[in-house]
């Protein structure tokens, strides 16, 4: 059998607005007073098991005590009324949970969406957190009929239980209620058809056109409530490797359609497409994007000829020479398709010409010492590029005109080359480069630049701390001009090793030091200067700096009959490196001198 409590706290379910004051009272039963020989002054109030300070407590009469809290902020507090029986023993009389929070704000931003094939979902902004159990009810009605209430689980949205009826306006609002108050949102009035979010278009397919390499035809299936709605589309596309989408102008896809031709595309390029739809009036919501579909535009003839150059091999006697014609494969953006082969035509005179069909990117031919004209065209499935034409002059002709003020410099991790054009109109420029090494031959790479270019960067994969020999040749209608060369580094480093110094001649008071240039493979940069450090075993070290053009230096004012230690360092723009230490001893007497 449950024991009757000794008293009660009022209110029994206290809910307080945060920041406000609150008073609770504890009323003891008469029987309790007599049984425990107590009165209200024996009451001890506690919050979460901690005694409430006396100044918050008031004894109203022998049975009743009150407690007052100002600026309540804790969300939940266990409030208990206790009596001190027999002077010391604390006995719980009654306990309540005091909650604090806020009345609901008026819900705002009420919006509804009809996801095709589903019931209507409405969402709203409930405003500030109430910290209390708050019920949100979505109400909806026609002018003449109420619909079932929708009780929100999360307080921010609710999906109604009934299927929407289109082309009839509905009124919708939200009611919010908790222990501290009740409030309604503004109502919204709309036709559910204007809130439809269609299912994404599907079966998107992409086909190309043999006639036009710049178009792709799209077709798809739209739902639109099973044909009940006319939908307009939004089409986006990108090249396969791009991350940003290109927008087809919305005005081009305003009318309801299930196909579209995208224009101004690049030939032989793979494009990815996606599409979404919305009611043609623009009301409602865009569908999610369709699954992506891709297609490749048809090939077109190559848009330009390959870069074209030649190298003459050592002569086979006097009658003819071997010439290696070389060209670069076109980038995809210019090949406009799969390059099947190249057509090379060599013409010696009007009557003598030879045509070659080549699948690679070079051709070695034997030519007499006459002037030749070589033409090169790339061919794909659709056709041939325009021809690149090179005049190969007689070897007896001396090339005139070369570029001037040739410079090379590293910038932004690229090796740049610039020059001043020659005074005669140029057809194009050829840049050739290779790594200078004493251990391996100079394997050349090359590139072609248009006649208008006088500054460019080398487009190969260059290595740091390697010496590049760069050659620039202007090409004229009559053939190549003179070549200008220079050396350059993409990035310098300190030398890999320092110079090895030796003595060439040692006298009583001077010594001629000599050294070899550091091999180019170990230089790692331009050697700007040398330093020579020399000292005796007891003296302080002396340092002299020597220009990089020297390979000898004379140390003077040396002491006779003395051991000297010498070391040399070589410096690039990026630092220095010491060579090995070398020792020599000056003689006690000069030549012919007697003790």
């Amino acid at each position: 059998q449950l024991l009757e409590p000794c008293g009660y706290i009022y209110p029994e379910f206290p809910v307080v607005q945060r920041g406000s004051n609150f008073t609770a009272i504890c009323v003891l039963k008469e029987a309790c007073l007599q049984h425990y020989y107590v009165n209200a002054s024996y009451i001890v109030w506690k919050t979460n098991h901690a005694a409430v300070p006396r100044e918050q407590v008031t004894v109203i009469n022998r049975t009743t005590s009150s407690v007052t809290f100002t600026d309540v902020v804790l969300p939940s507090v266990q409030l208990t009324c206790n009596i001190l029986s027999f002077g010391q023993i604390e006995q719980n009389v009654y306990g309540v949970t005091m909650l604090s929070g806020f009345p609901p704000d008026k819900p705002t931003n009420l919006t509804c969406i009809v996801n095709e094939g589903k019931n209507m979902l409405c969402q709203w902004d409930p405003g500030r957190e109430t910290y209390l159990e708050t019920n949100y009810t979505l109400k909806s009605e026609w002018a003449t009929e109420k619909f079932p209430d929708c009780q929100s689980k999360h307080g921010t949205s609710c999906m109604v239980s009934y299927m929407p009826t289109y082309y009839v306006n509905i009124e919708v609002w939200v009611e919010a209620e908790n222990a501290l108050g009740k409030v309604s949102s503004e109502s919204i009035n709309f036709d559910p058809v204007d809130k439809v979010k269609p299912t994404p278009p599907y079966n998107l397919s992409v086909t190309n056109s043999e006639e036009l390499s710049s178009i792709l035809k799209l077709s798809w299936v739209s739902s639109g409530l099973g044909g009940l709605l006319d939908l307009k589309s939004d089409i986006q596309y990108r090249t396969k490797d791009a991350s940003t989408w290109i927008q087809v102008p919305l005005e081009d896809t305003m009318s309801p359609r299930t196909s579209f031709t995208v224009q101004d595309l690049k030939p032989f390029t793979e494009y990815v497409f996606r599409i979404r739809s919305i009611k043609d009036s623009g009301k409602g919501y865009w569908s999610d994007w369709s699954e992506e579909a891709s297609g490749t535009t048809y090939e077109d003839r190559p848009s330009r000829p390959p870069s074209f150059w030649y190298k003459t091999n050592p002569s086979h006697g006097q009658e003819y020479r071997s010439v290696r014609l070389i060209w670069k494969a076109l980038p995809l953006s210019e090949a406009n398709g799969k390059i099947l082969d190249y057509e090379v035509i060599l013409t010696q005179s009007k009557s003598v010409s030879q045509t070659y069909t080549v699948t690679g990117t070079e051709l070695t031919v034997n030519l007499t010492n006459d002037r030749y004209v070589a033409s090169l065209a790339a061919r794909n499935k659709v056709g041939k590029s325009a021809a690149a034409v090179l005049t190969i002059p007689s070897p007896h002709v001396t090339a005139a005109y070369s570029v001037v003020n040739l410079k090379a410099f590293p910038k932004d991790n690229l090796l740049w080359v610039e020059w001043t054009p020659p005074p005669k109109p140029v057809s194009k420029y050829i840049l050739e480069w290779c790594v200078l090494s004493e251990n391996a031959p100079c394997v050349e790479d090359w590139q072609q630049e248009d006649a208008t270019v006088n500054r460019t960067h080398l487009r190969g994969r260059l290595l740091e701390s390697k010496c590049y020999q760069i050659t620039v040749t202007p090409v004229f209608a009559t053939g190549p001009g003179g070549s200008e060369s220079l050396k350059a580094y993409l990035k310098q480093a300190a030398p890999a090793r320092g110079p090895t110094v030796r003595t060439k001649k040692v006298g009583k008071n001077e010594a001629v030091l000599a050294w070899d240039q550091i091999p180019v493979d170990d230089q790692n940069g331009f050697i700007r200067n040398y330093s020579i450090s020399y000292r005796t075993s007891v003296g302080k070290e002396m340092v002299v700096h020597v220009d990089s053009s020297h390979t000898e230096y004379t140390l003077s004012s040396l002491s006779s009959d003395t051991l000297y230690m010498v070391r040399m360092a070589a410096y690039t723009d990026e630092g220095g490196k010491d060579g090995p230490e070398f020792t020599f001893t000056t003689p006690k007497f000069a030549q012919g001198e007697i003790e």
């Epitope: 006697g317 009658e319 030879q354 031919v365 006459d370």
Partner: nanobody, 125 residues
Framework: QVQLQESGGGSVQAGGSLRLSCGIS????????MGWFRQVLGKEREGVAA????????VYADSVKGRFTVSQDSSKNTVYLEMNGLKLEDTGMYYC??????????????????WGQGTQVTVSS
């Protein structure tokens, strides 16, 4: 591997005829012109006739003009030398040669890079 193989040589009476054939194989690109040369023991090899593989134009040594005819069958990769009115001085080893030099057809020996093994022609009285 480039190969030139002559055939059709032999012995013939003065005033008689012979037809030499040269089969060519192994070329990536066809030669620009083909030639026939002959060599008599102890003498320089001399040009007899040559034909352009493209246009079919031909040249002859003065000593054989009007008697010898050079021709080709592109489909069979074969070059022929038709020799009529053979003389005693036509005796010698006949070689087929191929040139890849892009120039007018010529019997200049220095312009030829590829040679056959030769076939013997003997003219007797």
């Amino acid at each position: 591997q480039v190969q030139l193989q002559e055939s059709g040589g032999g012995s013939v009476q003065a005033g008689g005829s012979l037809r030499l054939s040269c089969g060519i194989s192994g070329f990536t690109y066809r030669p620009t012109f083909m030639g026939w040369f002959r060599q008599v023991l102890g003498k320089e090899r001399e040009g007899v006739a040559a034909i352009s593989t493209g246009g079919g134009s031909s040249v002859y040594a003065d000593s054989v003009k009007g008697r010898f005819t050079v021709s080709q069958d592109s489909s069979k990769n074969t070059v022929y030398l038709e020799m009529n009115g053979l003389k005693l001085e036509d005796t010698g080893m006949y070689y087929c040669a191929a040139s890849t030099v892009i120039t007018s057809v010529s019997i200049n020996r220095a312009l030829y890079q590829y040679w056959g093994q030769g076939t013997q022609v003997t003219v007797s009285s």
